[in-house]
């Protein structure tokens, strides 16, 4: 999907009230400094892209955030800011949850989101440079 | 059963305002879009707004802006549209309709729908 | 004044097909692949016929298709029965800011 279409800002002010909340939340005791940011985002369309990916895809290390409240909410916020995303987002999850059987390694998903963190604090950083 | 019910008809003066409320029940409330749309006698259908209760999101048509509130209370999965300064065209039957998730611009399930007159 | 325009009236013969169309702009009809249709019965709330311009949820009838081409999309009913005589309005998803217009409805005869 091509996110260059999106509406910037709302998805901001989506992520500021509330998606920010729960990915905190999910991250509760652990420190900042517990994991390294590896993944980077270079403009908006880029990190809306790259957290995407991280949020909704599976991986062997990680296979379950797409049921967590953020993940619903990033997809919420997504489909309605995003034209066109739910045709070719949706049902391309929504067949990835059903596929998925591997057990989650919980220190792992910890590192993924802290990674999506850094991803949105990228969006934000990205957005004031632009106004 | 899957459903959405409205509140009872309501009948008001010029520059009142109305709260119609629509309690859902069969489904995940908070997931799905929840849009209130509105027919005078006669006439076609007339979108006032949209809540998303899962991200706390609220769109407005244009014509509205200002006069409609719409909030929703995820704890008894009901949604409530408010319109102020009520004028005598305002008189219609209120439905209340539920988008899709994630495709919150169809309404696949409706409300019975609740008749606000609004005379002097 | 409706931002999508569809004709006041159409009308057909039991067995027959009728086509209604819907005309909007690039903004929204043109724009995205976000049109649905609704039947309504005098009285009673609108029913969902077609979404995402040709798709149709359980429960209704093969008879009933959606296609779009332009700005312009449109509704057929065929093999046309007495039930089929109601209201269709047609609306569109039309960005961020303004999200749905409806059209201003036809009424379907069957004669």
């Known amino acids: 999907y091509d996110f260059t279409n999106c509406d910037f800002q709302k998805i901001e002010a989506d992520y500021l009230r509330t998606i920010s909340k729960d990915l905190i939340t999910y991250m509760s005791g652990t420190k900042s400094t517990d994991f390294n940011n590896t993944v980077s985002c270079s403009n908006r369309p880029h990190c809306l892209t790259e957290i995407q990916s991280l949020t909704f895809n599976p991986t062997p290390r990680c296979a379950s955030l797409a049921k967590e409240m953020f993940a619903r909410k990033t997809k919420a916020t997504l489909a309605l800011w995003c034209p066109g995303y739910s045709e070719t987002q949706i049902n391309a999850t929504q067949a990835m949850k059903k596929a998925r059987k591997s057990k989650v390694t919980t220190n792992k998903c910890l590192e993924q989101v802290s990674q999506l963190l850094g991803l949105w604090r990228r969006f934000i950083r990205t957005l004031l440079k632009k106004q | 059963q899957v459903q959405l019910v409205q509140s009872g008809a309501e009948v008001k003066k010029p520059g009142s305002s109305v709260k119609v409320s629509c309690k859902a029940s069969?489904?995940?409330?908070?997931?799905?879009?929840i849009s209130w749309v509105r027919q005078a006698p006669g006439q076609g259908l007339e979108w006032l707004g949209v809540?998303?209760?899962?991200?706390?999101?609220?769109i407005y048509a244009e014509k509205f802006q200002g006069r409609v509130t719409i909030t929703a209370d995820t704890s008894t999965s009901t949604a409530y549209m408010e319109l102020s300064s009520l004028r005598s065209e305002d008189t219609a039957v209120y439905y209340c309709?539920?988008?899709?998730?994630?495709?919150?611009?169809?309404?696949?399930?409706w409300g019975q729908g609740t008749l606000v007159t609004v005379s002097s | 004044q409706s931002a999508l325009t569809q004709p006041p009236s159409a009308s057909g013969s039991p067995g027959q097909s009728v086509t209604i169309s819907c005309t909007g702009t690039?903004?929204?009809?043109?724009?995205?692949?976000?049109v649905s249709w609704y039947q309504q019965h005098p009285g009673k709330a609108p029913k969902l016929m077609i979404y995402?311009?040709?798709k149709r949820p359980s429960g209704v009838p093969d008879r009933f298709s959606g296609s779009k081409s332009g700005n312009t999309a449109s509704l057929t009913v065929s093999g046309l029965q007495a039930e089929d005589e109601a209201d269709y309005y047609c609306?569109?998803?039309?960005?961020?800011?303004?999200?749905?217009?409806f059209g201003g409805g036809t009424k379907l005869t069957v004669l």
């Open positions: 309709a539920r988008g899709q998730e994630y495709f919150y611009w169809y309404f696949d399930l």
């Open positions: 069969g489904f995940t409330f908070g997931s799905y879009g």
């Open positions: 809540i998303v209760p899962l991200v706390d999101v609220t």
């Open positions: 690039i903004s929204d009809i043109g724009g995205y692949n976000r």
């Open positions: 995402e311009v040709s």
């Open positions: 609306s569109s998803y039309a960005g961020t800011d303004t999200f749905v217009f």
